[in-house]
């Protein structure tokens, strides 16, 4: 069966949008007006993994790019990266675990927990124009809550 996907944008709980920063990095900053067109559109794919009523496994690709967010160890630390893939083979229902995030719905906000590294979350900094990263703490200074906006195909 084909994997199901939808197009969306993400904003953190401070309403910062995500934009490309160089070829393999995302950063978070406040955008307004026409600048909103800079924000990254994700192709969110609903993939195989542990699911519950609040938790749905997804992969986050960049729309019309062969790039996916993935979680790997770098210098012994779980790290978020943009990974290039062969577009002939992706997306797929059985994504490798490094590409899988548990989309967790809490009080109308979303968290994206790494399936590869439990309790590590897609995170943004309070500061403007800083990289999106994988963080190992919730409820601290860093932001782990997002909202999702659907985008027509």
């Amino acid at each position: 069966a084909p994997v199901r996907s939808l197009n969306c944008t993400l904003r953190d709980s401070q309403q910062k949008s995500l934009v490309m920063s160089g070829p393999y990095e995302l950063k978070a900053l406040h955008l307004q007006g026409q600048d909103m067109e800079q924000q990254v559109v994700f192709s969110m794919s609903f993939v195989q993994g542990e699911e519950s009523n609040d938790k749905i496994p997804v992969a986050l690709g960049l729309k019309e790019k062969n790039l996916y967010l993935s979680c790997v160890l770098k210098d012994d630390k779980p790290t978020l990266q943009l990974e290039s893939v062969d577009p002939k083979n992706y997306p797929k229902k059985k994504m490798e675990k490094r590409f899988v995030f548990n989309k967790i719905e809490i009080n109308n906000k979303l968290e994206f927990e790494s399936a590869q590294f439990p309790n590590w979350y897609i995170s943004t900094s309070q500061a403007e124009n800083m990289p999106v990263f994988l963080g190992g703490t919730k409820g601290g200074q860093d932001i782990t809550d997002f909202t999702m906006q659907f985008v027509s195909s």
Partner: nanobody
């Protein structure tokens, strides 16, 4: 052409049981996640339950967890929903959905659904 034909609905008293069936054709049934959604009178669609393509994973809405059981028989291209301890609030038209994917608590995506079978729970 994809066809989904639900059956098994009817009138049942509170606390009673029903077993819904969905006969599928026109696609490779065993390859697809399947599920049930329902629509109560005057309400919107509500996701009820899903089952993975292999049948090894099942998911339920909080409102039916512990009372309903979803299952599938790939050799018969049939999806089932065993409904126990039925309540008045379970009254709805129940639809079988093909390639049902839950986006979040309120939204789903699916490719096809059947014409539905009416379940009425009343004394």
């Amino acid at each position: 052409e994809v066809q989904l034909l639900e059956s098994g609905g009817g009138l049942v008293q509170p606390g009673g049981s029903l077993r819904l069936s969905c006969a599928a054709s026109g696609f490779t049934f065993e390859d697809y996640q399947m599920g049930w959604v329902r629509q109560a009178p005057g309400k919107g669609l509500e996701w009820v339950s899903s089952i993975s393509a292999m049948g090894n994973r099942t998911y339920y809405a909080d409102s039916v967890k512990g009372r309903f059981t979803i299952s599938r028989d790939d050799s018969k291209n049939t999806l089932y929903l065993q409904m126990n301890s039925l309540r008045a609030e379970d009254t709805a038209v129940y639809y079988c959905a093909e390639n049902l994917v839950r986006v979040d608590r309120r939204r789903w995506m699916f490719d096809y659904w059947g014409q539905g079978t009416l379940v009425t729970v009343s004394s």
